[in-house]
Every structure is written in structure tokens, then in C-alpha cells.
């Protein structure tokens, strides 16, 4: 009998509010034994895969997706899904990335504290349809794997 895979979580470092031109790293986490993490983005058909998976703890693995220079086009909701043979997990909740103009004000913090979307109840059938128009992927030309070597 196949195991019931836990839903992944997604977080952003250093946070979910990123100044224009700064970097952000999405961190996807799942159980040990994950072969592939996929990062998808709402309203885009692009996505990004990595098999560069590291062990975050004895019971958890993770993958990191880095955007070196955030643009306005990178704003929006992101989510993770992972493949642990022989099947894919459910998608994570969406995590909203906000991109702000650099204000230069001394009192305005550069980023929100690190935010995440963790596992919740299994979504309804409609909410995890990766092909609905509201559910599309990444702007690949702006996205790099943090540790991925070719």
C-alpha cells in the first residue's frame, strides 16, 4: 500500500516582501526521500524543477529556488509540489510574493520576516488543478536553483 504523502510547505527567504532588484529564495520542504521538487506559479504556465534536494532534518528534505534580481513580473503566488516515487504529493498552499519599489526611507524595513505556507487540509478537487487558467508557473528566465550544478 502506497504511503499517504504529506503536503509540502513553502517559505521565502528573507521574506515575502522583496525590494525591486533584490534576491529571494523559495524553500520547498517535504519528507525524506523526495526525488524532485517543482515550483509553480499562479497565472503563468511556466514552472521549475530541481532534483537538487538536501536533507533539512532527520525527517525532512528541502529544495531552494533562488531569484537573483526580483522584478515586478516575479510578484504573485507560488506553490510547491514534490515527487517521491512512485507518486506526486498534493500542492502546497500558495505563498504570495510582493515586490516593492525601493523607497530609501531609513525606517522602512527591506523585507517582511520569513513567511511560509505549511501543510493544511487536503484541498478540494478544484483547488489543485494545475491546468486551470488561474494556476500557471514560473518566469523561468529569472529563476535559478540555489545549489544546482549542470
Amino acid at each position: 500500500q502506497e504511503e499517504d504523502l504529506p503536503r509540502p510547505s513553502i517559505s521565502a527567504e528573507p521574506g515575502t516582501v522583496i525590494p525591486l532588484g533584490s534576491h529571494v529564495t523559495f524553500v520547498c520542504r517535504g519528507p525524506v526521500g523526495v526525488q524532485t521538487f517543482r515550483l509553480e506559479r499562479e497565472s503563468r504556465s511556466t514552472y521549475n524543477d530541481t532534483e537538487d534536494v538536501s536533507q533539512a532534518s532527520p525527517s525532512e528534505s528541502e529544495a531552494r529556488f533562488r531569484i537573483d534580481s526580483v522584478s515586478e513580473g516575479n510578484a504573485g503566488p507560488y506553490r510547491c509540489i514534490y515527487y517521491k516515487p512512485p507518486k506526486w504529493s498534493e500542492q502546497s498552499d500558495y505563498l504570495e510574493l510582493l515586490v516593492k519599489e525601493t523607497s530609501g526611507g531609513p525606517d522602512s524595513p527591506d523585507t517582511e520576516p520569513g513567511s511560509s505556507a505549511g501543510p493544511t487540509q487536503r484541498p478540494s478537487d478544484n483547488s489543485h488543478n494545475e491546468h486551470a487558467p488561474a494556476s500557471q508557473g514560473l518566469k523561468a528566465e529569472h529563476l535559478y536553483h540555489h545549489h544546482h550544478h549542470h
Epitope: 504556465s45 524543477d49 478537487d125 491546468h131 487558467p133
Partner: antibody
Framework: QSVKESGGRLVTPGTPLTLTCTAS????????IQWVRQAPGKGLEYIGA?????YTYYASWAKGRVTISRTSTTVDLKMTSPTTEDTATYFC?????????????WGPGTLVTISS | ELVMTQTPASVSAAVGGTVTIKCQAS??????FAWYQQKPGQSPKLLIY???KLASGVPPRFKGSGSGTEFTLTISDLECDDAATYYC?????????????FGGGTEVVVK
């Protein structure tokens, strides 16, 4: 990397027929596979798709008439009770790396003829 | 159900000319859209996806634009080899149907 359809042949109306799309040179688990058909002299017609995450979608006309299933290396299209209107070349196709919207990898097609 | 309406059904132009093909979706499909070229006896070939990205090996004479419900394929500096039937496809749409709807096709004749 390639996909290839097989199983097309001449059958009488009502005879179930299973077409198989076989993946070579890539890991099928990462990809969506769509089935498309083309009747002689006609345009392309979407039948349905098997997504990487295991969901299956059908064109409205195809619901109840076909069933799509997948294994680790193949995606099958079962025609439950074909009629003469189902005579066509059947294609399977795989989407490109990094984008769900475009299908760049197509098989050569397999011809299905339904005739009494 | 999602319907893709493609116009014109046929178009003729001279070598070196320009052809424009339009495709309209019955509902907003975002960027879940592609253009294909098909020649008689051959499988479809991906030209444009996303809906403005050029597929590998496709010359920049082919240009895709649009989003939402209105999409356009422009072929400039027409060559004899461009004679083919062109199809638009949306692989968006609702969960239950219409996810992979094709347009009716446009036959391009090069004079």
C-alpha cells in the same frame, strides 16, 4: 527523447480498442501527455490528457467514450465502444520542459479505422 | 466548454509577404496557449507557446502575441516552406472540459 503511439488497427464498430503512447529517453513522471486525433482531411481534435500529478482530463465529447490511464512508461487511451466517426489518426504529445503550455514532442500517429 | 475560434480559415500571400492569424478564446486562458504548424502527412510542430515564446529551432519570422482571450500569430518574410495548416490550442480551461481545445485551423498558401 520521443513518444510513439501504437495499437491502431481496423476494428468493427463497438469493438474496444486500446492505444498506447510509449515514452523513450525521458522520465514520464514529470510530464503531461495529451491525446489528439485527426480525422481524414479534418483538423486537430483534443481528446484528453494525463497530467504529471496523475489527474486525467477529457474533452466534453470524449467523456464516457474513452479512458486515459498511465504507467511509469506509457499512457493508454482506451476507446470503449468506437463508432465509424472515430476513424482517425491518433497522436500523443508531451509538453516541453519548464512550460505546460506547449507540446513539442509528438509521435508519428497511429491510424484507427472503424468499419463494418 | 472552452471554444477556440480561429480566423481566417484560409489565407494566401506572396513569398516575402506577411500573414496574420487570429485566435479568440471563449473565456480568459491567461498564457495557456500555443501555435502549431502541420504539413500533410506529418505530426503537428510546436511554433509558439506561452503565448509569445519561440519553440526551439523556429525562426524569429514567426511571432506570437496576446493574452487572456485574444491571440495572434504573425508570419513575416514568407517562404515557400511556410505553406501549411496552422492551429492554435489552449491547454487551459476548466477542470471538467475544454482544457485542450484546438482552433479550426488556418491553411496558409504561399504564392
Amino acid at each position: 527523447q520521443s513518444v510513439k503511439e501504437s495499437g491502431g488497427r481496423l476494428v468493427t464498430p463497438g469493438t474496444p480498442l486500446t492505444l498506447t503512447c510509449t515514452a523513450s529517453g525521458f522520465s514520464l513522471y514529470k510530464y503531461n501527455i495529451q491525446w489528439v486525433r485527426q480525422a481524414p482531411g479534418k483538423g486537430l481534435e483534443y481528446i484528453g490528457a494525463s497530467t504529471y500529478a496523475g489527474y486525467t482530463y477529457y474533452a466534453s465529447w470524449a467523456k464516457g467514450r474513452v479512458t486515459i490511464s498511465r504507467t511509469s512508461t506509457t499512457v493508454d487511451l482506451k476507446m470503449t465502444s468506437p463508432t465509424t466517426e472515430d476513424t482517425a489518426t491518433y497522436f500523443c504529445a508531451r509538453h516541453i520542459d519548464g512550460d505546460y503550455s506547449g507540446y513539442a514532442l509528438w509521435g508519428p500517429g497511429t491510424l484507427v479505422t472503424i468499419s463494418s | 466548454e472552452l471554444v477556440m475560434t480561429q480566423t481566417p480559415a484560409s489565407v494566401s500571400a506572396a513569398v516575402g509577404g506577411t500573414v496574420t492569424i487570429k485566435c479568440q478564446a471563449s473565456q480568459s486562458i491567461g498564457t495557456w496557449f500555443a501555435w502549431y504548424q502541420q504539413k500533410p502527412g506529418q505530426s503537428p510542430k510546436l511554433l509558439i507557446y506561452g503565448p509569445s515564446k519561440l519553440a526551439s529551432g523556429v525562426p524569429p519570422r514567426f511571432k506570437g502575441s496576446g493574452s487572456g482571450t485574444e491571440f495572434t500569430l504573425t508570419i513575416s518574410d514568407l517562404e515557400c516552406d511556410d505553406a501549411a495548416t496552422y492551429y492554435c490550442q489552449s491547454n487551459g480551461g476548466s477542470i471538467s472540459n475544454g482544457w485542450g481545445s484546438f482552433g479550426g485551423g488556418t491553411e496558409v498558401v504561399v504564392k
